[in-house]
Interface confidence: low
């Protein structure tokens, strides 16, 4: 092989030298020379750097900020960053989930299709035909009608996408 | 420290094959390629080829080709070299020396291992 | 393949005087990048080789600064400023630009 004018995989080229990268967890304190590899100290308590690097600073860990809604769902390590989720209630709103905001409530006439999670929103669908929902939820799904034939029932009021049908008893013919 | 222990004195016979180890310490073994370099007695040095650990690349000497087998073992940081279809002439100290990758020069050189053949 | 050729192949000099060997190299050992692909190793009876001098003239790691190399292009020369019993041993020049590397014959070097 020829001298190197690049380096292979997890070193890098200085000085027209291949020095190593410091690994994951670790940054960087000063190059190799000629006679001592390249020096590397641990990221500090909160710090961390997640791939084979030549930084001299180890970056800060993401600080998951109640007053945003936010919570640590995943603590971070030397090597990871913190991951941060919303509270009971509430949603990322971006995939970074630096905020949160609270889940979005189905309207009567809509229900629930999917809950939200910590990173998705609420997904709300239209009740159909033979379904209402008469509250504002975040939870509730569409209601089937009631069936008043299985009550022996009549329907006196139909229902409606936000209303129930009204049972009522039957005619009698009088004698 | 930087090390390179070889292993021990051979005798083969002529056509037999020889296969020395070289245990590396002190370092990071994948970081630099390993060279062998041959003396036959009252002779000069030879280079027989190198090997990357990391990726197992090899550069044989042309010479030697077809011959020569030149590995690795990363999980005990031990080069290998493997020379088939002795002859005589192949009698000789057998070394591994590493490549300083900042130097590409021969930086350390194991203690040697003394191969000969003889019928 | 590159031939590298050492003169003289012996050389007897007195304790304290200069020790001058050369290294003429059948083509080139400059690469692009600027630097000279020539290096000096000593060997003593029974020792593998040390190496003395890397990339022309930088001394490696521990070596006393009365080694020195010195060069250009395809003519190469190591010196010893004061010689001293320690230095009485077999010097070979490399070069690595070009596969196979190749060594000069070596120059043996003794006290006068």
């Known amino acids: 092989p020829e001298p190197p004018t690049a380096c292979r995989e997890k070193q890098y080229l200085i000085n027209s030298q291949c020095c190593s990268l410091c690994q994951p967890g670790q940054k960087l304190v000063s190059d190799c020379t000629e006679f001592t590899e390249t020096e590397c100290l641990p990221c500090g308590e909160s710090e961390f750097l997640d791939t084979w690097n030549r930084e001299t600073h180890c970056h800060q860990h993401k600080y998951c900020d109640p007053n945003l809604g936010l919570r640590v769902q995943q603590k971070g390590t030397s090597e990871t960053d913190t991951i941060c989720t919303c509270e009971e209630g509430w949603h990322c709103t971006s995939e970074a989930c630096e905020s949160c905001v609270l889940h979005r409530s189905c309207s009567p006439g809509f229900g629930v299709k999917q809950i939200a999670t910590g990173v998705s929103d609420t997904i709300c669908e239209p009740c159909p035909v033979g379904f209402f929902s008469n509250v504002s939820s975040a939870f509730e799904k569409c209601h089937p009608w009631t069936s008043c034939e299985t009550k022996d029932l009549v329907v006196q009021q139909a229902g409606t996408n936000k209303t129930d049908v009204v049972c009522g008893p039957q005619d009698r013919l009088r004698a | 420290q930087v090390q390179l222990v070889q292993s021990g004195a051979e005798v083969k016979k002529p056509g037999a094959s020889v296969k020395v180890s070289c245990k590396a310490s002190?370092?990071?073994?994948?970081?630099?390629?390993m060279n062998w370099v041959r003396q036959a007695p009252g002779q000069g040095l030879e280079w027989m080829g190198n090997?990357?650990?990391?990726?197992?690349?090899?550069n044989y000497n042309q010479k030697f080709k077809g011959r020569v087998t030149m590995t690795t073992d990363t999980s005990t940081s031990t080069a290998y070299m493997e020379l088939r279809s002795l002859r005589s002439d192949d009698t000789a100290v057998y070394y591994c020396?590493?490549?300083?990758?900042?130097?590409?020069?021969?930086?350390?050189w194991g203690q040697g291992t003394t191969v000969t053949v003889s019928s | 393949d590159i031939v590298l050729t050492q003169s003289p192949d012996s050389l007897a000099v007195s304790l304290g005087e200069r020790a001058t060997i050369n290294c003429r190299a059948s083509?080139?050992?400059?690469?692009?990048?600027?630097?000279?692909?020539l290096h000096w190793y000593q060997q003593k009876p029974g020792q593998p080789p040390k190496l003395l001098i890397y990339?022309?003239?930088n001394r490696f790691f521990g070596v006393p600064d009365r080694f020195s190399g010195s060069g250009s292009g395809t003519d190469f020369t190591l010196t010893i400023s004061s010689l001293q019993a320690e230095d009485v041993a077999v010097y070979y020049c490399?070069?690595?630009?070009?596969?196979?590397?190749?060594f000069g014959q070596g120059t043996k070097l003794e006290i006068k």
């Open positions: 990339k022309l003239t």
């Open positions: 090997i990357d650990p990391y990726y197992g690349n090899t």
């Open positions: 490399q070069q690595s630009i070009h596969v196979p590397w190749t």
């Open positions: 020396a590493r490549l300083g990758l900042q130097l590409y020069a021969l930086d350390y």
């Open positions: 002190g370092y990071t073994f994948t970081g630099y390629n």
């Open positions: 083509q080139s050992l400059v690469h692009s990048n600027a630097n000279t692909y």
